[in-house]
Interface confidence: medium
């Protein structure tokens, strides 16, 4: 028996359902009584779901997995994972045994889009040319860690004096806070782009600062 899985990682959004595809080619006269199907975590060998002795043995993994029972006889051994969590990310092995056996691993990549960034200024009033301004760009509840880019009003990248921190919450999702310290000219526009590298999703935020005149 030959087991086939998709070579590309399966990308699943947090809280959605994902299908880890796995198939085999049954011989003529194949019956489910002959099938031993095991899904397990590749690294730890933890059992996720199994079909043995002619019946679905159910989920051994947080009761969020299911097979496609009506399709098994056709060679579809795919696994449905419900309400995907960050902790589900990783490699899953589909192990099929009929008379001989084969296995293959499929990778699950979990993702969550970042929120539209909110922009804050410090100080936020009495801004004058030559003043240092701290601009904070905050975006929430994304996964995996974001890439953050700053640009000025002309689209020129701003790489100096940027500090970015990313903290995971209890669900494993990241809140990103990127701080740009700039010197204010007469006026200026500053843009922050938060990119999810898996989803190739960009979230944009910008702020325009108009400096007040200097007085002696």
């Amino acid at each position: 028996v030959e087991v086939q899985v998709s070579e590309d990682p399966v990308v699943a959004l947090v809280d959605t359902d994902a299908t880890l595809r796995c198939s085999f080619s049954p011989e003529p006269g194949f019956s489910l009584a002959q099938l031993n199907l095991i899904w397990q975590l590749t690294d730890t060998k933890q059992l996720v779901h199994s079909f043995t002795e002619g019946r679905d043995q159910g989920s051994a993994y947080s009761n969020r997995t299911a097979l496609f029972p009506d399709l098994l006889v056709q060679g579809n051994a795919s696994l449905r994972l419900q309400r995907v969590r960050v902790t589900d990310e990783g490699s899953y092995t589909c192990f099929v045994s009929i008379q001989d056996f084969d296995s293959a691993a499929v990778s699950l990549q979990v993702a969550a889009p970042y929120s539209k960034p909110s922009m804050t200024l410090e100080p936020n009033k009495d801004l004058r040319p030559g003043n240092m301004v701290t601009i904070t760009c905050s975006s929430y509840q994304g996964y995996p860690e974001a890439e953050v880019f700053w640009k000025d009003g002309q689209g020129v990248p701003l790489t100096g004096n940027v500090t970015t921190s990313q903290m995971a919450n209890e669900r494993g999702l990241f809140d990103v806070h990127s701080v740009l310290r700039v010197v204010l000219g007469a006026n200026g526009t500053y843009s922050c782009l938060v990119r999810n590298p898996v989803l190739q999703q960009d979230a944009h935020g910008s702020v325009t600062i108009t400096g007040q005149p200097l007085t002696f």
């Epitope: 004058r128 030559g130 003043n131 100096g160």
Partner: nanobody, 116 residues
Framework: DVQLVESGGGLVQPGGSLRLSCAAS????????MGWFRQAPGKGVEWVST????????YYADSVKGRFTISRDNAKNTLYLQLNNLKTEDTAMYYC?????????RGQGTQVTVSS
């Protein structure tokens, strides 16, 4: 008390150069961003340039970009401004300032006059 003393100003012809210095004392110079400002006769105060504490990032007003260069020597507690290709409109009193323009954080100034 913060003390900032500018020097290096003078009379120079258009196209000429000058190097301004600002000797700092009374605070930990290497920890602070520093800036240059200027005030032309009858005009308001204009920001010229700023440098971060380590000296790795510099900022310039559009009017001086490509002609002026700000630098610092943290070992000597000194801020510099190199003025090249001077124009008559650069005539002004030049002040250095600790971080930004505010009372108690700036010097008394050094006069730069550009004239033929």
């Amino acid at each position: 008390d913060v003390q900032l003393v500018e020097s290096g100003g003078g009379l120079v012809q258009p196209g000429g150069s000058l190097r301004l210095s600002c000797a700092a004392s009374g605070f930990t110079f290497s920890r602070y961003w520093m800036g240059w400002f200027r005030q032309a006769p009858g005009k308001g105060v204009e920001w010229v340039s700023t440098i971060n504490s380590g000296g790795g990032s510099t900022y310039y007003a559009d009017s001086v970009k490509g002609r002026f260069t700000i630098s610092r020597d943290n070992a000597k507690n000194t801020l510099y401004l190199q003025l090249n290709n001077l124009k008559t409109e650069d005539t002004a009193m030049y002040y250095c300032a600790k971080e930004q323009w505010r009372t108690g954080s700036r010097g008394q100034g050094t006069q730069v006059t550009v004239s033929s």
